[in-house]
Interface confidence: low
C-alpha cells in the first residue's frame, strides 16, 4: 500500500478546523476489516486517532479530531482536526496497514493574526523638536512570533532605538510590544508594521506629531 | 495525574553553575508549560522562569536572564534548569512546577519535590 | 515587575475563627491571582484560581474575592491542618510573582 500526504505545510489558523489530507490505493476487494489506520505526533509518536478491527477506536489526543469515516473505502484516510491550538502545531504520521503497510508525515502549521496595533506615546504633551519620545507599538494574540519593522512618513525604515519584546499567553499566542525611541523632528509620522510571516498578514498603526495636538 | 520529579540536592562553589531536572509523568508534558520557582531559607516564592515545551519557548524574570537557561527533552518528558555565576545568595530549594490538565500555564497544581542548592565556598 | 503585598505578615487565631489575608497589586491585575498554601518542608498547594475559583480537592471553607488591584483570602472555620503559610500570585504579566506571605499560626 502507498500512502499519500500534501509535501505542502497545512495552515489552519487558531480556533478553525483543519484536515490533514492523507490517501491510499485500496486494491479491489478492499474491506475495512482489514484497515489499519493510525495517525500520531510524528516526533513523540502520541497517539492522535486510529482506526482498527473495522471500526472507529476514536479520539486519542484531547478529542478533538475525526477521520471521514464515508470515505475510507474509497481510501481517504484524512484526519480533520478541530478548534486547531498552537499547540497543535508540528508533523503528523499517517500510517496505514493493510497487508503490508506505509506511512508519510504532513505538517501543520498554526497562525493566527495580529491585531490592529496600538499606539501610545511618552510623553505625550508638550513636546518640542529635539525631544526624546518613546513611541510603543502593541499588538496582541497573534501566532508565530512576529516581525516588526518602524517606518518613518516617507515609508523609510526606521532603525535606530527599537527594542521588540514578544510574550506567549497561556494558549500560546504572542503579544508584541515594539518600543521606538526617537528624537523628535518639527512634525513627523511614525508607523509600526507587525507583520505575520505565514500569514503574510499586516497590521499597521501609526502616530502623527505635528506640535499639538497627535492624532492616532 | 501529573507527576514532577526533580534531581538531588547540590552543594556548589561560588561562581559555577548547576543544573537542575525535572522529570515529568502521567500527563503530555510537551504540551504544558514548566515553571522554575525558587525559595530561600526562611524567604518567600520567587518565579525563574518558564519553558512551554511543544513550542520551545523559555521566558525568565528579568533578575535571572542572562543567568538562568531553561529547556525541555521531550523525548524524556524532562525539564531543565541551569542557573550560572552562583552566589551565595543563590542558596534556595528550587522548584519546578506546571499547571496540569485544564488550569492555567501560569498556576500551579503540579510541584516538583524541591532541589536543595547550598552555595558555599 | 508587578508587586505584590500580603497583610498581615503574620496572623494569630484559633480553631473556629473566621479569618481574612489581604493581597494587594502595584498595579491592575484583573482576576489574574491565585493562592497557595505552604506547610515548612513541603511545595506549596495550590487553593484558589482567578480570584476566586476553588481548585479541585480544597475544602469550601477557603474562599477567594477582590479584582483590580485588592483580593482577599478567606477560611471561614480554621481547622487545625489550616495553620501554614499563604501566598498570593500575580499571572497578569511576566514576571509572575508572589506577595511575600502571610503565616498564620495558633493563638
Known amino acids: 500500500v502507498e500512502v499519500q500526504v500534501s509535501e505542502d505545510p497545512v495552515v489552519a489558523l487558531v480556533d478553525t478546523d483543519a484536515t490533514l489530507r492523507c490517501s491510499f490505493s485500496p486494491e479491489p476487494g478492499f474491506s475495512l476489516r482489514q484497515l489499519n489506520l493510525i495517525w500520531q505526533l510524528t516526533d513523540t509518536k502520541q497517539l492522535v486517532h486510529s482506526f482498527t478491527e473495522g471500526r472507529d477506536q476514536g479520539s486519542a489526543y484531547a478529542n478533538r479530531t475525526a477521520l471521514f469515516p464515508d470515505l475510507l473505502v474509497q481510501g481517504n484516510a484524512s484526519l480533520r482536526l478541530q478548534r486547531v491550538r498552537v499547540t497543535d502545531e508540528g508533523s503528523y504520521t499517517c500510517f496505514v496497514s493493510i497487508q503490508d503497510f506505509d506511512s508519510a508525515a504532513v505538517s501543520l502549521q498554526v497562525a493566527a493574526p495580529y491585531s490592529k496595533p496600538s499606539m501610545t506615546l511618552e510623553p505625550n504633551k508638550d513636546l518640542r523638536p529635539g525631544d526624546m519620545v518613546t513611541i510603543t507599538c502593541s499588538s496582541y494574540q497573534g501566532y508565530p512570533e512576529a516581525e516588526v519593522f518602524w517606518k518613518d512618513g516617507q515609508g523609510l525604515p526606521l532603525t535606530g532605538n527599537v527594542t521588540t519584546s514578544q510574550m506567549a499567553n497561556e494558549r500560546g499566542l504572542f503579544d508584541v510590544h515594539s518600543v521606538l525611541r526617537v528624537v523628535l523632528g518639527a512634525n513627523g509620522t511614525y508607523s509600526c508594521l507587525v507583520r505575520n510571516p505565514v500569514l503574510q498578514q499586516d497590521a499597521h498603526g501609526s502616530v502623527t506629531i505635528t506640535g499639538q495636538p497627535m492624532t492616532f | 495525574q501529573v507527576q514532577l520529579v526533580e534531581s538531588g540536592a547540590e552543594v556548589k562553589k561560588p561562581g559555577s553553575s548547576v543544573k537542575v531536572s525535572c522529570k515529568a509523568s502521567?500527563?503530555?508534558?510537551?504540551?504544558?508549560?514548566i515553571s522554575w520557582v525558587r525559595q530561600a531559607p526562611g524567604q518567600g516564592l520567587e518565579w525563574m522562569g518558564r519553558?512551554?515545551?511543544?513550542?520551545?519557548?523559555?521566558n525568565y524574570a528579568q533578575k535571572f536572564q542572562g543567568r538562568v537557561t531553561i529547556t525541555a527533552d521531550k523525548s524524556t518528558s524532562t525539564a531543565y534548569m541551569e542557573l550560572s555565576s552562583l552566589r551565595s545568595e543563590d542558596t534556595a530549594v528550587y522548584y519546578c512546577?506546571?499547571?496540569?490538565?485544564?488550569?492555567?500555564?501560569?498556576?500551579?497544581?503540579?510541584w516538583g519535590q524541591g532541589t536543595l542548592i547550598t552555595v558555599s565556598s | 515587575d508587578i508587586q505584590m503585598t500580603q497583610s498581615p505578615s503574620t496572623l494569630s487565631a484559633s480553631v473556629g475563627d473566621r479569618v481574612t489575608i489581604t493581597c494587594r497589586a502595584s498595579e491592575t491585575i484583573s482576576s489574574w491571582l491565585a493562592w497557595y498554601q505552604q506547610k515548612p518542608g513541603k511545595a506549596p498547594k495550590l487553593l484558589i484560581y482567578k480570584a476566586s475559583s476553588l481548585q479541585s480537592g480544597v475544602p469550601s471553607r477557603f474562599s477567594g474575592s477582590g479584582s483590580g488591584t485588592e483580593f482577599t483570602l478567606t477560611i471561614s472555620s480554621l481547622q487545625p491542618d489550616d495553620f501554614a503559610t499563604y501566598y498570593c500570585q500575580q499571572y497578569y504579566s511576566y514576571p509572575i510573582t508572589f506577595g511575600q506571605g502571610t503565616r498564620l499560626e495558633i493563638k
Open positions: 502521567g500527563g503530555t508534558f510537551s504540551s504544558y508549560a
Open positions: 519553558i512551554i515545551p511543544i513550542l520551545g519557548i523559555a
Open positions: 512546577a506546571n499547571g496540569g490538565d485544564s488550569s492555567s500555564w501560569y498556576t500551579f497544581d503540579y
